[in-house]
Interface confidence: low
């Protein structure tokens, strides 16, 4: 043999119980020793230290700590150096060196040593990763090194978690006992902070211990706060909010059209969209995720806004008989009262609808004219005027005439036409052609649609001249012989000497 | 240049109420917590606690609950250590330290103080 | 809480001269998941706030000279200064920065 020892490198046993610590020693056989010795000595193997004597087989003078709490459970003659410590209190935690005396200089202290534990509390242990839907394994180990109190296990908070497995007492690596019992169960989000118990009591004691760990579930995020469907009025603050449960925190992420707009590593994220456009109308996403999973859900934020100016598309300028048609349309939250007016009167009209279209089937002069296009909610009204023009051939008005006074004659042609005709009266008695353009004899004036032209001629004539007006633009002629009225029915203004 | 500057010394009777200020700059204010830490005269340091400046949520040591509160002006990127009915024991330089925050939880990584506010001392004698 | 002890309270050395001082844990401060000590050392002079030279025990802090080294793992630790400076009369505290936060007792360092 050779000098050594063999001992737990670290043991541990509850407070007020016994611990025993197994130790074997050996040392040259050729020694021959006729007696065997030893020392246990507290936290120190150097006797020149003054070390705290737990057990010395030479004396019954140990250190006043192990008065009667120190015994050798070995035979030091079989090399066999097991001590008991009785009645453990926490001084009592730290390092046992073993020294073999075999008499004269044949005296060793093991460098081996135990590293004495008083605990009390049972050590729970919980895997690093607890998932959520995952079965998990926690076991609860408290040593069992004390033969005279031996401990008895039981899970405290376990109540739906599943029955224990008590795997009893078993033997560790280096010699030391402990026993063991398991808890097999699939946790669930709702066990996440969870409060899981073991207790260790001693049988004819009043000596128990607890502990406990608190179940840290993993578990993907599940939205569990978020705005319903969302009505603001334009220019108005909004406020979304989305809220999740998960274990660790999500990133919560707010997005639009596949934008990101917020995001943050927290239970929940409010969006906050100041003053907002009709641009910010659309459906919104929170997306919640952790290591473990994701969750998503939308929200429409639908921008009540008034009608924005209507816009008139479509023909302004038209032929007699032709087809008009004019679309008016706008945009608004909600959709709009739309209504087509002229001169007050409706001439189309649509409810929540963004446009109206306005058809005149073959257009008439009367249908030239300002028009209106009004668009209306609750939130405000805008109109758009726009002018319609129909373009036809002339038309000599039935009151068109010639009146003679004293030695003047004046004949009057109104002409209604668009665009603006020529015209001219003639004189066929005479040969003779007055056009518009002869300011000497002809004053024209128009008005609207309405182009009146005045001929005036002097001079004193036996009978009145037969008087023709022509009338002329783009889409036709018309010519009237002038009928002459009696004097009395006009007011003349005599022109010139 | 990253800087914590702290408000000047103050001289309190016991039973009044002390704000300490900790204005931040050359740095995110939100991306750094801020502790606070206590040094009576002549004695070691006492960590107090910390906040969280992007979620304002304090976190008291345990000597530290009860008289004290912590609070953040974050527009101004300015922390506030609040101290209302004083004690002769509470005679102390008072320090504010940043340390930066990991949002995602992943755990005490990089919890180390690295730049600290040049002191307050507040003397509490009747 | 974890307690940090400091050894010794004070030392005086010579400019020049090399110094180590000890920091103890009552319990671990080596984090499992990523193996790093969550221990660092601060140096305070006169009148003075606190200024990080090491974290995570061994790294040093931007700007510190490299006469300042830390070292250990788990509950023990060391910060040694080569070629001390008369500058260096500071005290010197560990800190702890795993659990709640604790700073050890100080090393005051004087310069003979």
């Known amino acids: 043999g050779h000098w050594g020892a063999w001992m737990p490198s670290s043991i541990s046993a509850f407070e007020g119980t016994c611990v025993s610590i197994p130790c074997r020693f050996d040392f040259p056989d050729e020694l021959r020793p006729a007696v065997v010795h030893g020392v246990w000595y507290f936290n120190s193997p150097y006797p020149k230290n003054y070390p705290p004597v737990v057990f010395k087989s030479r004396t019954q003078v140990v250190h006043e700590s192990f008065q009667g709490r120190s015994r050798l459970l070995g035979d030091l003659g079989l090399r066999n150096c097991t001590l008991l410590l009785s009645t453990l209190s926490p001084e009592l935690g730290g390092k046992y060196y073993f020294r073999g005396d075999l008499g004269g200089y044949n005296q060793y202290t093991f460098s081996e040593h135990s590293v004495l534990d008083i605990i009390n509390t049972p050590n729970i242990v919980v895997p690093p990763e607890v998932v959520a839907g995952t079965e998990v394994e926690v076991s609860c180990m408290v040593p069992d090194n004390c033969p005279e109190l031996r401990p008895e296990l039981s899970w405290l908070g376990h109540e739906g978690l599943g029955e224990p497995t008590v795997l009893g007492r078993l033997r560790e690596d280096e010699g030391t006992w402990v026993q063991v019992s398991l808890l097999h169960f699939v946790p669930t989000r709702e066990a996440n902070g969870h409060r899981l118990g073991c207790q260790a009591a001693f049988p004819n004691t009043t000596l128990q211990f607890e502990g406990y760990a608190s179940l840290d579930v993993k578990y993907p995020p599940v939205i569990v706060e978020m705005n319903s469907s969302v009505e603001a009025i334009e220019g108005s603050h909004v406020s979304l909010l989305c809220g999740a449960d998960s274990n660790p925190p999500p990133l919560l992420t707010w997005m639009r059209d596949g934008m990101v707009l917020r995001e943050a590593v927290a239970e929940s994220l409010y969006l906050d969209l100041e003053e907002v456009t009709p641009a910010e109308d659309g459906i919104y996403a929170c997306l919640a995720e952790n290591a473990y999973g994701q969750d998503n859900r939308t929200v429409e934020l639908s921008v009540m806004y008034a009608p924005w100016k209507p816009t008139v598309n479509g023909t302004v300028v038209a032929v007699e008989g032709e087809t008009v048609s004019i679309l008016c349309s706008t945009q608004s939250n909600p959709d709009p009262i739309l209504t087509i007016f002229k001169e007050k009167q409706i001439l189309a009209t649509v409810i929540y609808e963004s446009q109206l279209q306005l058809e005149l089937p073959a257009v008439t002069p009367e249908d030239d004219g300002e028009y209106w296009c009004v668009a209306e909610n609750q939130y405000g009204q805008r109109a758009t005027a726009f002018n319609l023009s129909v373009e036809f051939a002339p038309i000599i008005l039935l009151e068109s005439h010639c009146a003679a006074a004293r030695d003047t004659v004046q004949c009057l042609c109104v002409v209604k036409s668009n665009p603006e005709p020529s015209v001219a009266f003639e004189l066929p008695s005479r040969n003779v052609t007055v056009n518009e353009t002869e300011r000497e004899f002809v004053y024209s004036e128009r008005s609207g649609l309405l182009l009146t032209s005045i001929l005036t001629l002097r001079g004193q004539a036996q009978a009145p001249p037969r008087v023709i007006c022509t009338s002329r633009n783009l889409y036709g002629t018309q010519s009237l012989e002038l009928p002459f009225q009696g004097a009395h029915r006009l007011m003349w203004a005599k022109i010139g000497p | 240049e990253i800087q914590l500057v702290q408000s000047g010394p103050e001289l309190k009777k016991p039973g009044e109420t002390n704000k300490i200020s900790c204005k931040a700059s050359g740095y995110t204010f939100t991306n750094y917590g801020m502790n606070w830490v206590k040094q009576a005269p002549g004695k070691g340091l006492k960590w107090m606690g910390w906040?969280?400046?992007?979620?304002?949520?304090?976190t008291y040591a345990d000597d530290f609950t009860g008289r004290f509160a912590f609070s953040l002006e974050t527009s101004a990127s300015t922390a506030y250590l609040q101290i209302s009915n004083l004690k002769n024991e509470d005679t102390a330089t008072y320090f504010c330290a940043r340390n930066p925050i990991n949002y995602y939880g992943i755990n005490y990584e990089g919890y180390v103080m690295d730049y600290w506010g040049q002191g307050t001392l507040v003397t509490v004698s009747s | 809480n974890i307690m940090m002890t400091q050894s010794p309270s004070s030392l005086a050395v010579s400019a020049g001269e090399k110094v180590t001082m000890s920091c103890k844990s009552s319990?671990?401060?080596?984090?499992?998941?990523?193996?790093?000590?969550?221990l660092a050392w601060y140096q305070q002079k006169p009148g003075q706030s606190p200024k990080l030279l090491i974290y995570?025990?061994?790294t040093r802090e931007s700007g510190v000279p490299d006469r300042f080294t830390g070292s250990g793992s788990g509950t023990d630790f060391t910060l040694t200064i080569i070629n001390v400076h008369t500058e260096d009369l500071a005290v010197y505290y560990c800190?702890?920065?795993?659990?709640?936060?604790?700073f050890g007792t100080g090393t005051k360092l004087e310069i003979k």
């Open positions: 800190h702890q920065y795993l659990s709640s936060l604790t």
């Open positions: 906040i969280n400046t992007y979620t304002g949520e304090p």
């Open positions: 319990h671990s401060v080596l984090y499992s998941s990523n193996q790093k000590n969550y």
């Open positions: 995570w025990a061994s």
